[in-house]
Interface confidence: medium
């Protein structure tokens, strides 16, 4: 649907993307799956996350942030070895305020790169971007004073994922607009990995029967479940190995006792 970004180079800055498809707008597609993907944003010159619906869309879509950066950012591989001192702000902290398409009135917080502070803004309830936090504290923790962590930069202590308005999850009504809402995720102090690893297994809404794995934060193990092919949440992996690799790293060991809290 979205082809190349319809903008001139002068509007976008001087950087030319490595491939023409890197200039395409993120295209979630007309389907209902919820697949975490990455695209290169011509406006911010960064790779950013979006939710892909599972069909159609375009070539500006990558399974990993790394793959996106390698493909679309000139000279990325040369500069990829960064100084390990201190933590970096996740890319989404630099996104512009985006209230989204819907007409709700939700008090949220965003990181303002001009003032270098977290500030209040009004979120409409759907779409928007990930520079969107439910509490000031959460915003500060992630964008103002990021904590150094061994896990990849863009995956540290993320707040509940702000869903794209296309995802098939719980729904509620805000100001007479029916808005898909992100599933409520329990906040756990002993887990500092990806928040979707805390979500319960969700079979989704379709009729297929696919073998998948989900991370059980209570047992610290990945278990099998049947996925119906669309909807559901991101605690959904095609192999046990991928599941463990993605979620196991977030557990924090209690050093004095040597056990998982």
């Amino acid at each position: 649907l979205s082809e190349e970004a319809d903008d001139t180079d002068s509007e976008l800055g001087s950087m030319k993307p490595l491939h023409t498809f890197c200039a395409m707008k993120a295209d979630d597609g007309p389907c209902k799956a919820m697949i975490r993907s990455y695209f290169f944003n011509m406006y911010t010159h960064q790779c950013e996350e979006f939710i892909y619906g599972g069909c159609e869309g375009n070539e500006n879509r990558f399974d990993t942030l790394e793959e996106c950066k390698k493909t679309c950012i000139p000279g990325y591989e040369k500069t990829a070895v960064k100084a390990a001192s201190g933590a970096e702000r996740p890319d989404f902290c630099f996104l512009e305020e985006d209230p989204g398409l819907c007409r709700g009135y939700m008090k949220r917080y965003l990181y303002n790169n001009q003032t270098k502070q977290c500030e209040r803004f009004v979120y409409g309830g759907c779409l928007g971007n990930r520079n969107n936090f439910e509490t000031l504290d959460e915003c500060k923790k992630i964008c103002e004073n990021p904590v150094h962590s061994p896990s990849p930069v863009n995956e540290v202590q993320m707040s509940d994922y702000v869903t794209d308005g296309n995802t098939v999850t719980d729904r509620s009504t805000v100001n007479n607009i029916v808005v898909p809402q992100s599933p409520k995720v329990p906040r756990r102090r002993d887990y500092r990995g990806r928040p979707w690893c805390l979500q319960p297994a969700d079979s989704g809404l379709c009729k297929a029967s696919e073998r998948r794995f989900y991370y059980n934060s209570a047992t610290g193990k990945c278990h099998r479940f049947n996925y119906t092919g669309c909807g559901g949440n991101n605690n959904n992996f095609t192999t046990r190995r991928r599941c463990l690799r993605s979620c196991k790293t977030g557990l924090i060991k209690n050093k004095s006792k040597g056990v998982v809290k």
């Epitope: 649907l1 082809e3 319809d6 209902k32 599972g54 379709c206 009729k207």
Partner: antibody, heavy 117, light 107 residues
Framework: QVQLVESGGGLVQPGGSLRLSCAAS????????MDWVRQAPGKGLEWVSS????????YYADSVKGRFTISRDNSKNTLYLQMNSLRAEDTAVYYC??????????WGQGTLVTVSS | DIELTQPPSVSVAPGQTARISCSGD??????AHWYQQKPGQAPVVVIF???NRPSGIPERFSGSNSGNTATLTISGTQAEDEADYYC?????????FGGGTKLTVLG
């Protein structure tokens, strides 16, 4: 506010040609996919053609493929539909519509094309 | 090709609930959108992405999509809701419309 105004409809003989125009205003025309949708008298909506993105990728319904050509002039904020080898079954009101993501959020009022001898 | 099937007509008494269905093999995986068209007028979107109502559309319009069937529900139907209703989805890169349903408000 967003406005779409179609023109160019009229009476044409079978085998003849006609060019429809859709003048757009109130939005950044080049940033949106644009489509033609038609409606035969007393019948339902039928998607005809799409043009999307700055590369102007084009798509056509099987019923018009090879006979109709969609195009756009972003400098004039205008969408076109060149219709050749017209048939009686092409008789319809032709609407231009703005494609927002995967649905049509704005429609013109339509222009009537009558193919008859 | 995918077909979206709608009942040709639905009748409802004023104040009652009207349900218009749209079935298609692609609907378990694809979103449905709904348009209202009154005689001599262009269509207007009343529901997008299965359940979302654009601003300006009355609260009595709602949508759902489960399995092979998307449904447009009009609760407390009013005389002004009498119109043709079309579902629209997507297939193979292009939009697809249902055949349309004429909603008649009795009395």
């Amino acid at each position: 506010q967003v406005q779409l105004v179609e023109s160019g409809g009229g009476l044409v003989q079978p085998g003849g040609s006609l060019r429809l125009s859709c003048a757009a205003s109130g939005f950044t025309f080049r940033s949106y996919g644009m489509d033609w949708v038609r409606q035969a008298p007393g019948k339902g909506l039928e998607w005809v053609s799409s043009i999307r993105g700055s590369r102007s990728s084009t798509y056509y319904a099987d019923s018009v493929k090879g006979r109709f050509t969609i195009s756009r002039d972003n400098s004039k904020n205008t969408l076109y539909l060149q219709m050749n080898s017209l048939r009686a079954e092409d008789t319809a009101v032709y609407y231009c519509a703005r494609l927002y993501r995967y649905w049509f959020d704005y429609w013109g009022q339509g222009t009537l094309v009558t193919v008859s001898s | 090709d995918i077909e979206l099937t709608q009942p040709p007509s639905v009748s409802v008494a004023p104040g009652q609930t009207a349900r218009i269905s749209c079935s298609g093999d692609n609907l378990p995986n694809y979103y449905a959108h709904w348009y209202q068209q009154k005689p001599g007028q262009a269509p207007v979107v009343v529901i997008f992405y299965d359940v979302n109502r654009p601003s300006g559309i009355p609260e009595r319009f709602s949508g759902s999509n489960s399995g092979n069937t998307a449904t447009l529900t009009i609760s407390g139907t009013q005389a002004e809701d009498e119109a043709d209703y079309y579902c629209q989805s997507w297939w193979d890169g292009v939009p697809v419309f249902g055949g349309g349903t004429k909603l008649t408000v009795l009395g």
